[in-house]
């Protein structure tokens, strides 16, 4: 019995659902009562899911698996694995027995995008050309381990004094911290690129350092010019700094973070102590760095609703303020492609191809192409629906008349992350069925 599975590994984002495709060719008169279907882990032989004695025996794998029962009789023995975890990575074997017996193994490659790197500088005040500084680039909750590259403002690699560490958390996701020690020139831009080798996703961070003395007078409060981009569910640092004068003590400091538009209080430090979070208990100051002029705010478990402008007020004897923008983002999943109708297709038939990508933010841009790179702009309808967390599911539908064969590709772009997710379907031969049967 010939059992067919994809040659390439199935790539699935952590937290999304994955389909491990497996198919066989049922003979005429085949009934599900004859079928024994077993999915197991290839290496350990641990049972994952089974269908025997004419019925679904259910999941033996943390209740996160399901079969496509309505498609089994047509030879579709695929397995749906829900809420993928890092620990799921590996090979799964699909055993099919009717009268004959066949099996094949499919690999699951788990991936998670790295967050936009946050950049920190130490020391971060009174910098002069010739000073040695430490620049730290931190990117969170990615998988598998990242590749990290440093560049100067002209794109030249900085390979000198770099130390990179990667630590896995309890879910197996990696936090990467890369530290560059560098001697300052008159000014300079230092860029860090964190690459996910499986997703081929690059996350960029950069910091521009202009060594200079702070002017006297009002407190000069410094924040990043560009919006801080934070992935949903990760922590974000809204950087804010001031230059304390000699003899400065925290007893003199009044620090207030508030929402720029509504003036809602977010966090404050007054009368020599941290007054705590007034914003859903998800904010914190870097108390051990405050005396050095670091008034940055840590915002935990970022949500879509956090997007907007935050103002950092610093008062010592003088007063200063500046606003920093938070841009929230979430990567779109690899699109799933469906075809309707999906059986006995012939050239000239009109089909509907649906490209679906999930849980991204902000709204996506969707593009369709044929197999020669030509845009398919004709009969396309794209809808985007926000869920209760504000994340968008995008569904783009293309109606097209089939040629003798053809490839139809869908590109879902996250405009903030500049992340592209691709899906494609190739329709060949006549007549045919989708997905292709063994």
């Amino acid at each position: 019995l010939e059992v067919q599975v994809p040659e390439d590994p199935v790539v699935a984002l952590v937290g999304t659902d994955a389909t491990l495709r497996c198919s066989f060719s049922p003979e005429p008169g085949f009934s599900l009562a004859q079928l024994n279907l077993i999915w197991q882990l290839t290496d350990t032989k641990q049972l994952v899911h089974s269908f025997t004695e004419g019925r679904d025996q259910g999941s033996a794998y943390a209740n996160r698996t399901a079969l496509f029962l309505d498609l089994l009789a047509q030879g579709n023995a695929s397995l749906r694995l829900q809420r993928v975890r890092v620990a799921d990575e590996g090979s799964f074997t699909c055993f099919v027995s009717i009268r004959d017996f066949g099996s094949a193994a499919v690999s699951l490659q788990v991936a998670a995008p790295y967050s936009k790197p946050s950049m920190t500088l130490e020391p971060n005040k009174d910098l002069r050309p010739g000073d040695t500084v430490t620049i730290t680039c931190s990117s969170y909750r990615g998988y598998p381990e990242a590749e990290v590259f440093w560049q100067d403002g002209q794109g030249a690699p900085l390979t000198g004094n770099v130390t990179t560490s990667q630590m896995a958390n309890e879910q197996g996701l990696f936090d990467v911290h890369s530290v560059l020690r560098v001697v300052l020139g008159a000014n300079g831009t230092y860029s860090c690129l964190v690459r996910n080798p499986v997703l081929q996703q690059d996350a960029h961070g950069s910091i521009t350092i202009t060594p200079q003395r702070s002017p006297t007078g009002a407190v000069e409060v410094q924040v990043p010019e560009d919006p801080v981009v934070a992935l949903v569910g990760t922590d974000a640092t809204l950087r804010c700094s001031f230059s304390p004068e000699p003899g400065f003590s925290l007893a003199q400091l009044n620090l207030i973070w508030q929402l720029t538009d509504t003036k809602q209080l977010v966090h404050s430090f007054t009368e020599g102590r941290d007054q705590g979070s007034a914003y859903a208990n998800r904010t914190a100051l870097f108390l051990d760095l405050l005396a050095q002029g670091n008034a940055s705010l840590r915002l935990q478990r970022v949500r879509v609703a956090d997007e907007g402008s935050f103002t950092c007020f610093v008062s010592i004897r003088d007063f200063g303020s500046a606003a920093v923008s938070l841009q929230v983002a979430a990567p779109y999943s690899k699109p799933s492609m469906t075809l309707e109708p999906n059986k006995d297709l012939r050239p000239g038939d009109t089909v509907t191809i649906t490209c679906s990508s999930y849980r991204g933010y902000p709204e996506a841009e969707v593009f369709w192409q044929d197999g020669q790179g030509a845009p398919l702009t004709g009969n396309v309808t794209t809808s985007q629906m926000a869920n209760e967390q504000g994340l968008f599911d995008v569904h783009s539908v293309l109606r097209v008349v089939l040629g003798a064969n053809g490839t139809y590709s869908c590109l879902v772009r996250n405009p903030v992350l500049q992340q592209d997710a691709h899906g494609s379907v190739t329709i060949t031969g006549q007549p045919m069925t989708f997905p292709p049967e063994a």
Partner: antibody
């Protein structure tokens, strides 16, 4: 070596037609679309249209609709561009180019050497 | 139609200069390609799929994207870089080119 070799220069009278050929070699002719791009003296690049040599599907820029005809001969791996009702502003270098790559990233990776068409009375 | 507007149209610079050429699309594009053309020659592929250097293109060339604005940067101009550069999209019909930026020796 992948190559597109175009026919030689042409001088034409206003109102007449011109047919430029583009012979492909070094790759499977039916696997990629052939596009035609023209460049008037001292001007930029202007897309005219393309043909899929396999299906013979064509698409033309609105400006040239009804005046340009793109054809392809699979047996000789040659694409043709015919432009009718010529006027003096059609004086230009005409290029054929292969649109190549892999889904979803495509670009003109090979260009013909160009054919100069002069329209003059 | 998606219009591509390049700026500047002409740029005079010296060897060793850092130069930027901008291509602004009238609406969002899935990707942008760039071509280099020298007088009397056919265009050559230079950068494809927004930021990938074509074969043989030196690493001093790079592209950054902000919204619908694509910026081609040459970090340190070399004599062989003086040419005309065109951007191109085919995210929607018709395929369009920018009007070109001519990079001349100062």
């Amino acid at each position: 070596e992948v190559q597109l070799v175009q026919s030689g220069a042409e001088v034409k009278k206003p109102g007449s037609s011109v047919k430029v050929s583009c012979k492909a070699s070094g790759y499977s002719f039916t696997s990629y679309t052939i596009h035609w791009v023209r460049q008037a003296p001292g001007q930029g690049l202007e897309w005219m249209g393309y043909i899929n040599p396999n299906s013979r599907n064509t698409d033309y820029a609105q400006k040239f609709q009804g005046r340009v005809t793109l054809t392809a001969d699979k047996s000789t791996s040659t694409a043709y561009m015919e432009l009718s009702s010529l006027r003096s502003e059609d004086t230009a270098v005409y290029y054929c180019a292969r649109y190549s790559g892999s889904t979803p990233y495509w670009y003109f990776d090979v260009w013909g050497q160009g054919t100069t068409v002069t329209v003059s009375s | 139609d998606i219009q591509l507007t390049q700026s500047p149209s002409f740029l005079s610079a010296s060897v060793g200069d850092r130069v930027t050429i901008t291509c602004r699309a009238s609406s969002s594009v899935s990707y942008m390609n760039w071509y280099q053309q020298k007088p009397g020659k056919s265009p050559k592929p230079w950068i494809y799929a927004t930021s990938n250097l074509a074969s043989g293109v030196p690493s001093r060339f790079s592209v950054s994207v902000s919204g619908t604005e694509h910026t081609l940067t040459i970090s340190s101009l070399q004599p062989e870089d003086f040419a005309t550069y065109y951007c191109q999209q085919w995210s929607s019909n018709p395929l369009t080119f920018g009007q070109g930026t001519k990079l001349e020796i100062k």
